[in-house]
Every structure is written in C-alpha cells, then in structure tokens.
C-alpha cells in the first residue's frame, strides 16, 4: 500500500561534511516496526546509503559502521549523514516502510538535494 513521505528539497552540508534533515511520513497508525532507508540517486542509478529498523519501543538504531545516525519521534525521523565530500552531492531519498503488523505500507519522499562543498585548504603561513 502507498504512503506519503515528505522531506526538504534542499540541504547544505556543513563544512565538516555533515547534513541533517527530517523525513516525515503519513501517520504510522499501529505500526510497531518501521524501516527507514536512505537512498542516493545519481543519474538513473539508485544506491542504498544506509538503513535502520526501529520499533515503537526502541530508538532508531543504525549499524555501528553506518554513515548515518538518526532519532525517531512519532512519524518523524531526523536523519544525519556524515563523512560527505563534494563527490557526495546528489539527491538523497528517504524511503519508509511500515513493516509490522500488517498491512505493509511503503512511502518514498521526493528527495533532498544535498550540496557538499569541500573546504578550501588553509594557505601555508610563513
């Protein structure tokens, strides 16, 4: 079944390569287990950046080696991507799946364009 997901159109990463935005989805109703996936679209290719499953009892938990962190509150997920470089500029799409109990719902946002500007190296001081 389809579900709406919303995310900001544009986000500028910090000079340290960190970008944060909120992914909000249609009310989870009685969903007890929710999976959030961050996808990066480059041209016609879509790659998974990170994913996490959380329950209404637990906090959002990404794998320890993940480039993402996040917190959940109701039907909002605050996502943070770290370690971004200029090459990482692109469209980041939030996908939300209400996994359990049935019925299954899935929603995808329109994507957040994240701009990453590598910091200029400091000039050598004499």
């Amino acid at each position: 079944k389809g579900m709406h997901a919303a995310q900001p159109a544009v986000v500028l990463a910090s000079s340290r390569g960190v970008a944060s935005f909120v992914c909000e989805y249609g009310s989870s109703g009685n969903a007890a287990e929710v999976r959030v996936t961050m996808l990066r679209q480059a041209g016609s290719q879509m790659t998974e950046v990170c994913a996490a499953t959380y329950t209404v009892e637990d906090e959002l938990a990404f794998l320890d080696d993940s480039t993402c962190t996040g917190t959940s509150s109701g039907n909002k997920v605050n996502l943070t991507i770290q370690g971004l470089r200029a090459m990482g500029t692109g469209l980041y799409i939030c996908k939300v799946e209400l996994m359990y109990p049935p019925p299954y719902y899935v929603g995808m946002g329109n994507g957040t364009q994240i701009y990453v500007i590598d910091p200029e190296p400091c000039p050598d001081s004499d």
Epitope: G29, N30, E33, V56, P101
Partner: antibody, heavy 116, light 112 residues
Amino acid sequence: EIQLVQSGGDLVKPGGSLRLSCKASGYTFTNYGMNWVRQAPGKGLQWMGWINTYTGEPTYADDFKGRFTFSLDNAKNTLYLQMNSLRAEDTAVYFCARRSIYYPYWGQGTTLTVSS
Amino acid sequence: DIVMTQTPLSLSVSPGEPASISCRSSQSIVYSNGNTYLEWYQQKPGQSPKLLIYKVSNRFSGVPDRFSGSGSGTDFTLRISRVEADDAGVYYCFQGSHVPWTFGGGTKLEIK
C-alpha cells in the same frame, strides 16, 4: 503508568449477549493495536483477533467470525468485545492485550459464564 | 492456520536444575521482513500472562537472565538455566508472524 482495566463480565443465559470493556490509560491509545485473548476454564490461551485502533479495522480468528465484534471508543480510550448468541462453550476468562511487536501489557481478565 | 505444538505438556523440576520447553510450528513463522515474531509467556493461576521472550531470543526488560530463547524456522526452545520456586506456572509460545496469530497449548512447570 500504563494500565488496561477490564469490566463487563457476567453470568448470561445461552443465546444471550454481553459486551466486555477494556479501558486503556497511560499511553496514546491509537498508537497500538489491541487484541482479545480467550481462556476457557483449565485450558490454554486462544487468540481471538485484534483491532487497529488507528483505522478501526478488526481482524478475527476463524473461530470468532460472526458472533463476536471488536469496536472502539477512541474518545474514551476504550476497546469493546460484543458477544452474541452465547453458548456454554464461550464460558471463559477474556483478556485484552496491547500489542506492538509483543504483548507487554494485559488486562486483568474478566469472566463470562454462560449457563441456564 | 499455523499450529504451535508445545512439548512436554508438563514437567517437574527441582530447584537449581535446568528446564527446557520445546515449541514447534506447523510451518515456517519467518515474517516477510525476515523477522520471526515468536514469543514466550508465563502465566500463574488467576493471573494475566507475562512476557518473557520476544523475537525468538530477546529477553523482555526485567526478566531474569536465567530465561533464554532460541530456535529458527519451525523449532523453538525456552530454557531456564536454574529453576527457582517462583518459576512455577504455565508457559506458552506464541507466533505473531502469520494471521491468525496463535498460541501453543501450554506447558505446566512444577517445582519438586
């Protein structure tokens, strides 16, 4: 504190009807599915079904389709079990339980006795 | 419908000894998302059931580490490493993977 308080148990004649209540408190009622579980005297637990408290959509186990109806009053944070055309074999303790990915919270149970 | 078969129907164990209860499902209870919603509940006379284990092997908060769950697919086990007097009661497995969700028939644990 999260609580599920049940009421409505009674002695009913065969063919009669009864409505049981389960009042929830201490959490947002519409965030969690609510279930009914039956336990006949000296017997095991039997899952009757659940109702989505957000959409109001019920799901019944096959044995409980027809004579049993789950309903809600979200303004009162209350779940109901309407039982019709009661039979002796419906004599049991009825539990409500809140489900997420498990049942951490149960009502205290309420007893229905069907006898002439 | 999925039938959950528990064995033994009853067992009598001395305090300090281990106990093991088996639960077998009539078909796989792996849900479409890859999770297995298999739970264990303890019920004492006149009381509501209490959650012990969820998703096969996760101990619910406040449950002593003497209790553990294991298994996969169709075969699951609840183990009590050292039985205590307070563990007496009836134990039920439950599958919440495929509707209609179903309980096992129960296993009565008596303490010698």
